[in-house]
């Protein structure tokens, strides 16, 4: 039994890090493998993660972590019974994938303006709370070509767009994701999408 693709890990910079790897053949990850992880400092405890299957030869492990700080560094040991298959380390602050934003809402009651709001996925004391920027994806359910991305580079989790920049009388969906430039993070997963019917009054034309 050998590791084909070494574990790569990402952290949500709060409570979970996720590690994925591939074995050289079909593996029952939960019965055959264990990933041990330990914070590097005196008297720290070793924790055991039981991996789950992620495709035939793929394994994934969710490592529970206490409130991450930038100095945290973990040793990782991948075991198959008594055999050490791989040894490595992981610094959560250097491999951040933010949590996905939540509670995406489209407010259509503002005259001819769409207001999209969502929630920051971090509590105010978390470092990422004040460092997230967002991308909002809006697309038409009727027309696959009607697909647009709005970059929200300010901190407020909201976006205003003129309703007339979208077609009237059809349904649209929106979703949002986040990243943090300060830690050069990857993008978060997309939030669940929300749907609305876009309609607005055409301006009265005078001749």
């Amino acid at each position: 039994m050998k590791v084909l693709q070494e574990p790569t890990c990402v952290s949500d910079y709060m409570s979970i890090s996720t590690c994925e790897w591939k074995m050289n053949g079909p593996t029952n990850c939960s019965t055959e493998l264990r990933l041990l992880y330990q914070l590097v400092f005196l008297l720290s405890e070793a924790h055991t993660c039981i991996p789950e299957n992620n495709g035939g030869a793929g394994c994934v492990c969710h490592l529970l972590m206490d409130d991450v700080v930038s100095a945290d560094n973990y040793t990782l040991d991948l075991w198959a019974g008594q055999q050490l298959l791989w040894k490595g380390s992981f610094k959560p602050s250097e491999h951040v994938k933010p949590r996905a934003p939540g509670n995406l809402t489209v407010h259509t009651n503002v005259s001819d303006t769409l207001l999209l709001t969502w929630s920051n996925p971090y509590p105010p004391d978390n470092y990422l709370y004040n460092h997230l920027t967002y991308a909002v994806n809006i697309w038409s359910e009727n027309d696959p070509a009607d697909f647009r991305i709005y970059n929200v580079t300010y901190l407020e989790p909201s976006l205003r767009i003129a309703a007339r920049t979208l077609k009237s009388g059809i349904s649209y969906r929106a979703r949002v994701r986040a990243w943090a430039q300060c830690y050069n993070t990857t993008w978060s997963e997309w939030s669940p999408s929300t749907k609305w019917h876009n309609s607005y009054r055409e301006p009265f034309e005078q001749h």
Epitope: L43, D66, G102
Partner: antibody
Framework: QVQLVESGGGLVQPGGSLRLSCVAS????????MNWVRQAPGKGLEWVSY????????YYADSVKGRFTISRDNAKNSLYLQMNSLRDEDTAVYYC????????WGQGTLVTVSS | DIQMTQSPSAMSASVGDRVTITCRAS??????LAWFQQKPGKVPTRLIY???SLQSGVPSRFSGSGSGTEFTLTISSLQPEDFATYYC?????????FGQGTKVEIK
């Protein structure tokens, strides 16, 4: 081995105050965020409060906000819950529980609020 | 605040039965969900975290699934020591919230 021992519970009248303590051993307390969780007699679990190891930030359940204060003394390996303006509905066994996500619990201390 | 609704609140089952308990969140919590077991007079112990990750030392007959708002705890073959109360917990955001509990009793 990890051990959490709560104390300070007892009988108190409505409107009164009580201070609970939780002494930790078997791990580096200063590196762990901590919680208080309670359970009213014959009822379910209710999260009460959290204090971060990293920032010292605190969070509270709405039911205790403004009345309870969580604090810690890393030099004494101790977690505290100051409970003021106690009500009948605060009667419960109070547990301290360690992060991440309540991996270790103390045995609990009973707080009874009654006249 | 996020509400967690567990069902059923109580159930009777026999040794060897397959038992399923569900937990519904009032809004999307991704996979930030844990399951705890509590026996009478005892302290709760964590069975599952991150919706589907088995806690080390917990028997493999316990499994968790789900993401977003719908979650399930399954006991594939109920054993005598599994008669207890089970709670789900969301830790996606503060305040953290538990489900109201599911008591699994002997039929």
């Amino acid at each position: 081995q990890v051990q959490l021992v709560e104390s300070g519970g007892g009988l108190v009248q409505p409107g009164g105050s009580l201070r609970l303590s939780c002494v930790a051993s078997g791990f580096t307390f200063s590196h762990s965020s901590m919680n208080w969780v309670r359970q009213a007699p014959g009822k379910g679990l209710e999260w009460v409060s959290y204090i971060s190891r990293a920032t010292g930030a605190v969070y509270y359940a709405d039911s205790v906000k403004g009345r309870f204060t969580i604090s810690r003394d890393n030099a004494k390996n101790s977690l505290y819950l100051q409970m003021n303006s106690l009500r009948d509905e605060d009667t419960a066994v109070y547990y301290c529980a360690r992060e991440p996500v309540f991996d270790y619990w103390g045995q609990g201390t009973l707080v009874t609020v009654s006249s | 605040d996020i509400q967690m609704t567990q069902s059923p609140s109580a159930m009777s089952a026999s040794v060897g039965d397959r038992v399923t308990i569900t937990c519904r969140a009032s809004q999307d919590i991704s996979n930030y969900l844990a399951w705890f077991q509590q026996k009478p007079g005892k302290v709760p112990t964590r069975l599952i975290y991150a919706a589907s990750s088995l806690q080390s030392g917990v028997p493999s007959r316990f499994s968790g699934s789900g993401s977003g708002t719908e979650f399930t705890l399954t006991i594939s073959s109920l054993q005598p020591e599994d008669f207890a109360t089970y709670y789900c917990l969301q830790w996606s955001s503060y305040p953290r919230t538990f489900g109201q509990g599911t008591k699994v009793e002997i039929k």
